[in-house]
Interface confidence: low
């Protein structure tokens, strides 16, 4: 009696169980009563990453330099190419289909976390006592100058964008 279900790594076709093609190979012809499944390896720029009955391999991803992409890991017959972003850029999505420049933190904000190839710069507002007067992708908020340690007094208060201005103490006669 013909089977209704097949073992792992097999598939049901024409009332019989045929072997699936291994990763890296595509199906050329189904098995018959007399012959095994015929599989053919994927070509140089293609892959299949599972046991399958696909008649065509998938094309490797192209890391398009126009989109800021570069090869992180070259594809094989069993794995897709992995793209990453060029220096100074990060992926716009988890699948990394294109890249954008890292964000700079504006004056008044400092870098909390420097960007990576997959994540953008994380900025944070400079808290009281700290400032940033630059637009930067790596500068943290800096502490206001301590006038006291220089035996000076604050002449102009600091903000989140400017340092304090120190000056000499008024000397009474």
């Amino acid at each position: 009696e013909p089977p209704t279900a097949c073992r792992e790594k097999q598939y049901l076709i024409n009332s019989q169980c045929c072997s699936l093609c291994q990763p890296g190979q595509k199906l050329v012809s189904d098995c018959t009563e007399f012959t095994e499944t015929e599989c053919l390896p994927c070509s140089e720029s293609e892959f299949l990453d599972t046991w399958n009955r696909e008649t065509r391999c998938h094309q490797h991803k192209y890391c398009d330099p126009n989109l800021g992409l570069q090869v992180q890991q070259k594809g094989t017959s069993e794995t897709d190419t992995i793209c990453t972003c060029e220096e100074g850029l990060h992926c716009t999505s988890e699948s990394c289909e294109s890249c954008v420049p890292h964000r700079s933190c504006l004056p008044g904000f400092g870098v909390k976390q420097i960007a990576t190839g997959v994540s953008d710069t994380i900025c944070e507002p400079c808290p009281v006592g700290f400032f940033s007067n630059v637009s930067s992708a790596f500068e943290k908020c800096r502490p206001w100058t301590s006038c006291e340690t220089k035996d000076l007094v604050v002449q102009q208060a600091g903000t989140n964008k400017t340092d304090v201005v120190c000056g000499p103490q008024d000397r009474q006669r």
């Epitope: 053919l40 390896p41 070509s43 140089e44 720029s45 293609e46 065509r56 391999c57 094309q59 570069q70 090869v71 992180q72 890991q73 070259k74 017959s77």
Partner: antibody, heavy 115, light 112 residues
Framework: QVQVQESGPGLVKPSDTLSLTCTVS????????MSWIRQPPGKGLEWIGA???????YYASWAKSRVTISVDTSLNQVSLKLSSVTAADTAVYYC?????????WGQGTLVTVSS | DIQLTQSPSFLSASVGDRVTITCQAS??????LAWYQQKPGKPPKLLIF???NLASGVPSRFSGSGSGTEFTLTISSLQPEDFATYYC??????????FGQGFGGGTKVEIK
């Protein structure tokens, strides 16, 4: 800067071995296949062979018995050796990045086989 | 090795003409086909791979089509800088001992 440059002697004697070096910069040889192609004067392009990012070598059938392609990733270099040369091996020899998608080529180096 | 038959070998055309070059592979190479442009004294320049994908910086007047054994390169409106020799190149890979790779014989596009 991403580039590929071939170097080697411009003149080789018949029956000697032709040795060329391809020096790359701006990318890693472990991430790319590299191919050698040649072009006899006034003729078309002829694929010689390639070396994969993992080190596997692939040669055109005419070249199998005479060609060796190797890679030194630490020096960023791919080399081509063609033994028992004749006048028919006179050509511009190109090194290129890739296999079927040759996206980066050297300027080529002319090798003349003559006594 | 794989045989790639390119036609025509020579082609005379004028600026603004639509030009078509064909490449026939001796066996199925899926979409593993590239097109290159070569000018005298220069290395070839990648135009298209795989089969129909334009390489970086290539003008949109170039297009490619085909799969399996029949491929076409089309230049929709020939420009003065397009007069050159064009090559197809294709291959397949199954293992270090079973693969194919080759170039077509080239098509020289000349000014009429």
């Amino acid at each position: 800067q991403v580039q590929v440059q071939e170097s080697g002697p411009g003149l080789v004697k018949p029956s000697d071995t032709l040795s060329l070096t391809c020096t790359v910069s701006g990318f890693s040889l472990s991430s790319y296949d590299m191919s050698w192609i040649r072009q006899p004067p006034g003729k078309g392009l002829e694929w010689i062979g390639a070396i994969g990012g993992a080190g596997g070598t692939y040669y055109a059938s005419w070249a199998k018995s005479r060609v060796t392609i190797s890679v030194d990733t630490s020096l960023n270099q791919v080399s081509l050796k063609l033994s028992s040369v004749t006048a028919a091996d006179t050509a511009v020899y190109y090194c290129a990045r890739g296999w079927t998608r040759l996206d980066l080529w050297g300027q080529g180096t002319l090798v003349t086989v003559s006594s | 090795d794989i045989q790639l038959t390119q036609s025509p070998s020579f082609l005379s055309a004028s600026v603004g003409d639509r030009v078509t070059i064909t490449c026939q592979a001796s066996e199925d190479i899926s979409s593993n086909l590239a097109w290159y442009q070569q000018k005298p004294g220069k290395p070839p320049k990648l135009l298209i791979f795989p089969a129909s994908n334009l390489a970086s910086g290539v003008p949109s007047r170039f297009s490619g089509s085909g799969s399996g054994t029949e491929f076409t390169l089309t230049i929709s409106s020939l420009q003065p800088e397009d007069f050159a020799t064009y090559y197809c190149q294709g291959g397949y890979w199954t293992s270090t001992s079973n693969f194919g790779q080759g170039f077509g014989g080239g098509t020289k596009v000349e000014i009429k």
